[in-house]
C-alpha cells in the first residue's frame, strides 16, 4: 500500500504519457487521477512502466472501481491484466469478444494461467454457453482448449459450436471426450451431403457407435487407415468383412500392415476365415 502524500507542485498529471515513467511510486499515487487513468488506459501499454509502477496504477483502479472494472477499462488493460488475480477477475462482467481477444493476446504463447482460465470461465458463463465464435477464438489461442475440458464441461457445448472445431483441435482428446463430442458433431453436420459430411465428421469418429459406421459403409466414403485405427474397438468388432471393405474402399489393403494392432487385430479374430479370404490380403483369423 502506498502512503497518501500531496502531489509536488507542477507534477499533477494532465494526461497519461512517457513523462510518468520518471515518477516515483508515491508520486504516481499522489499525482495521477484514477479517473484520468481509466479514460486513458489504452496509453498505458505504450509506456514502459516498471512492475512496481504498474502495481500503483492497478491500486488506483481498484480504489476507483471496488466492485470490479467496467468493460471499457478491461478492454484496454493490456499488460496490466497480468497483474490481476483470479479474485479481481471474478468481479468483472466481460461480454465483448473483442475484450476477450485483447486480453488473450497479452498472454499469447504462454500456458494457461489461473487468470486466463477465470476470464474464460466468466466470459462463457456470461454468454450462457460456449458458442461458436467464442470457441473459434479460444482454439485459435489455445489449440488444446477443447481437449482440456472434462466430458461434463463438453456436454454443455452446443452442437452449433462444433462448426468452429478444426481436426487439430481434437489431437489430444481421449476416447471419453470423443464419446461426448461425436453426437454433437453428427447433429451439427446432419444436413450436409455424403462426401462433405464425411470430411467434417471424420475427426470425431473416435466416438462413433457401430450403427453409424455401418451407415457410413453404405456411402462410398473411402475411410483412410489412420481414421479407422482411431475407431472404438467395440464399435468395429460387429462390422462384417463386407462392411469394412465398403468403409475403407481402396484403403482396405492397408489392413494387412495393421493386422497386429487394435482394432484390426481384434476385428480379424471375430471374422470367419472364409470371409477374410475374400479380401485376398492373407489375413489370418
Amino acid at each position: 500500500e502506498v502512503e497518501k502524500t500531496a502531489c509536488p507542485s507542477g507534477k499533477k498529471a494532465r494526461e497519461i504519457d512517457e513523462s510518468l515513467i520518471f515518477y516515483k511510486k508515491w508520486e504516481l499515487e499522489a499525482c495521477v487521477d484514477a479517473a484520468l487513468l481509466a479514460t486513458q488506459m489504452d496509453r498505458v501499454n505504450a509506456i514502459p512502466f516498471t512492475y512496481e509502477q504498474l502495481d500503483v496504477l492497478k491500486h488506483k483502479l481498484d480504489e476507483l472501481y471496488p466492485q470490479g472494472y467496467p468493460e471499457s477499462v478491461i478492454q484496454h488493460l493490456g499488460y496490466l491484466f497480468l497483474k490481476m488475480s483470479p479474485e479481481d477477475i471474478r468481479k468483472w462482467n466481460v461480454t465483448s469478444l473483442e475484450t476477450l481477444k485483447a486480453l488473450l493476446e497479452v498472454n499469447k504463447g504462454h500456458e494457461m494461467s489461473p487468470q486466463v482460465a477465470t476470464l474464460i470461465d466468466r466470459f462463457v458463463k456470461g454468454r450462457g454457453q460456449l458458442d461458436k465464435d467464442t470457441l473459434d477464438t479460444l482454439t485459435a489461442f489455445y489449440p488444446g482448449y477443447l481437449c482440456s475440458l472434462s466430458p461434463e464441461e463438453l456436454s454443455s457445448v452446443p452442437p452449433s459450436s462444433i462448426w468452429a472445431v478444426r481436426p487439430q483441435d481434437l489431437d489430444t482428446c481421449d476416447p471419453r471426450q470423443l464419446d461426448v463430442l461425436y453426437p454433437k458433431a453428427r447433429l451439427a453436420f446432419q444436413n450436409m451431403n455424403g462426401s462433405e459430411y464425411f470430411v467434417k465428421i471424420q475427426s470425431f469418429l473416435g466416438g462413433a457407435p457401430t450403427e453409424d459406421l455401418k451407415a457410413l459403409s453404405q456411402q462410398n466414403v473411402s475411410m483412410d487407415l489412420a481414421t479407422f485405427m482411431k475407431l472404438r474397438t467395440d464399435a468395429v468388432l460387429p462390422l462384417t468383412v463386407a462392411e469394412v471393405q465398403k468403409l475403407l474402399g481402396p484403403h482396405v489393403e492397408g489392413l494387412k500392415a495393421e493386422e497386429r494392432h487394435r482394432p484390426v487385430r481384434d476385428w480379424i479374430l471375430r471374422q470367419r476365415q472364409d470371409d477374410l479370404d475374400t479380401l485376398g490380403l492373407g489375413l489370418q483369423g
Epitope: E111, M112, S148, D171
Partner: nanobody, 116 residues
Framework: QMQLVESGGGSVQAGGSLRLSCTVS????????LRWYRQALGKEREFISA???????SYSDSVKGRFTISRDNAKNTAYLQMNSLKSEDTAMYYC??????????WGQGTQVTVSS
Amino acid sequence: QMQLVESGGGSVQAGGSLRLSCTVSGYTDYRLVLRWYRQALGKEREFISAIYSDGVTSYSDSVKGRFTISRDNAKNTAYLQMNSLKSEDTAMYYCKATGSGGVAYWGQGTQVTVSS
C-alpha cells in the same frame, strides 16, 4: 519444458493392489489434463483413465470399478490406485499430460507385472 516421472510399478499377485504416481514438473497450465495409458508386450498403447482440471474423472471399460485416478494439485501429481489386479493388467503404464496448448507430453513409463 514439461517433464513427467512415473513411479510405483512392480510385481504383484493377482487380486493385489498397486498405486502408481505421475509427477509433473516445468509446466503450470491451469487446464492440465493427466491421463494414464498402458501398453502390453506386442500390443499398442491403450487409454486407461483421465483426470481433468475440474477434478472430473473418466475410465476405460476394462478398468472401471477397479482403478481410481486422483490428483494432488499442490504436488503436481496424479495417482492411479489399481485394485483387484488381473494378469491381463500386466503392461508398461504411461502418464500423459496435455494442456491448453495442445501439446502432449509422455513419461518414460513404469512396469506393472501381475502373476497368477
